[in-house]
């Protein structure tokens, strides 16, 4: 069962998560990114089902395209290279789901832009901690 | 409504050069990054340049690269492209385009203007 | 340089489904869009996302992309459809907008 500080510690982790994708959406979604509606074009692939830490997995699948999206924006937007923004996620992502049991993504049929893309993971997160709260 | 007029096109010759203006309406044109396009006489279309909603940042297809700069008047609610050292596969008719913020494309475009470069 | 490739030209009776398609390698990771265009007038877009439509666009305009396919079909296409018609996407890194060389669509 989970103890009290285990539970906390996932909790932070989510929270670390969840400001990080906020703050590549508000870099990125503002008139300000002249890159945005280049970033628009990239096809992200959003989990069918998104209600357990082990879905998470789907999230790790698609870091190396949120990558190569981020690359385009100007390094001012972000306080990080999009490199070691994605790496510090991937640690996060990494640690919450645990690699105990081996989780395959199962994808919706329909795909999304960048920005519907972070905010379902972001309302993910915030749905996550408030469970945990 | 939201419009797009464009002026300036004619015919030049080679090497000479030409200034298109492209007029914005119905819109707040400061929160936008612009584009020009053009599109040769039977030919398909090319993006040639773009410019951020403030003009610090631009962007140039390979082709013009070095002859053409764009920029902006947001006092004036205009974009520019200015055009040096004119070619003859320049010749084409020019639009200007407005990169949408919702979606992956240009949405809203100018009518158009035929710059021809000939001797 | 990026391609994306449609055939030049496609003719079509009134009342007949169209089916224009537009191939590039960046598509699995790419939206395409779809721009008609009229003669004598600018480009208008049709289809956004693969297969969303913007308001104002008949229902008979619907689009569609597999693997490094897209396709855009009129169903019932009428002789106001006939036109240019140019996919687009950006290139693989997403840096630079790119048209497909367009299919003139004829409607007779």
């Known amino acids: 069962a989970p103890t009290s500080s285990s539970t906390k510690k996932t909790q932070l982790q989510l929270e670390h998560l969840l400001l990080d994708l906020q703050m590549i959406l508000n870099g990125i979604n503002n008139y300000k990114n002249p890159k945005l509606t280049r970033m628009l074009t990239f096809k992200f692939y959003m989990p069918k089902k998104a209600t357990e830490l082990k879905h998470l997995q789907c999230l790790e699948e698609e870091l190396k395209p949120l990558e190569e999206v981020l690359n385009l924006a100007q390094s001012k937007n972000f306080h990080l290279r999009p490199r070691d923004l994605i790496s510090n996620i991937n640690v996060i992502v990494l640690e919450l789901k645990g690699s105990e049991t081996t989780f395959m993504c199962e994808y919706a049929d329909e795909t999304a832009t960048i920005v519907e893309f972070l905010n379902r993971w972001i309302t993910f997160c915030q749905s996550i901690i408030s469970t945990l709260t | 409504q939201v419009q797009l007029v464009q002026s300036g096109g004619g015919v030049v010759q080679p090497g000479r050069s030409l200034r298109l203006s492209c007029a914005a309406s119905?819109?707040?044109?400061?929160?936008?990054?612009m584009n020009w396009v053009r599109q040769a006489p039977g030919k398909g279309l090319e993006w040639v340049t773009l410019?951020?909603?403030?003009?610090?940042?631009?962007y140039y297809a390979d082709s013009v690269k070095g002859r053409f700069t764009t920029s902006r008047d947001n006092s004036k609610n205009t974009l520019y492209l200015q055009m040096n050292s004119l070619r003859a596969e320049d010749t084409a008719v020019y639009y200007c385009?407005?990169?949408?913020?919702?979606?992956?494309?240009?949405?809203?475009w100018g009518q158009g203007t035929m710059v021809t470069v000939s001797s | 340089s990026y391609e994306l490739t449609q055939p030049p030209s496609l003719s079509v009776s009134p009342g007949q489904t169209a089916t224009i398609s537009c191939s590039g390698d960046a598509f699995p990771r790419k939206f395409a869009y779809w721009y008609q265009q009229k003669s004598g007038q600018a480009p208008v877009l049709v289809i956004y996302e693969d297969t969303r439509r913007p308001s104002g666009i008949p229902e008979r305009f619907s689009g569609s992309s597999s693997g490094t396919m897209a396709t855009l079909t009129i169903s019932g296409a009428q002789v106001e459809d006939e036109a240019d018609y140019f996919c687009?996407?950006?290139?693989?890194?997403?840096?630079?907008?790119?048209f497909g060389g367009g299919t003139k669509l004829t409607v007779l």
């Open positions: 687009y996407t950006t290139s693989s890194s997403g840096t630079h907008p790119v």
């Open positions: 119905g819109f707040t044109f400061s929160n936008y990054a």
């Open positions: 385009a407005r990169d949408s913020t919702t979606l992956g494309a240009f949405d809203v």
């Open positions: 410019i951020s909603y403030d003009g610090s940042q631009k």
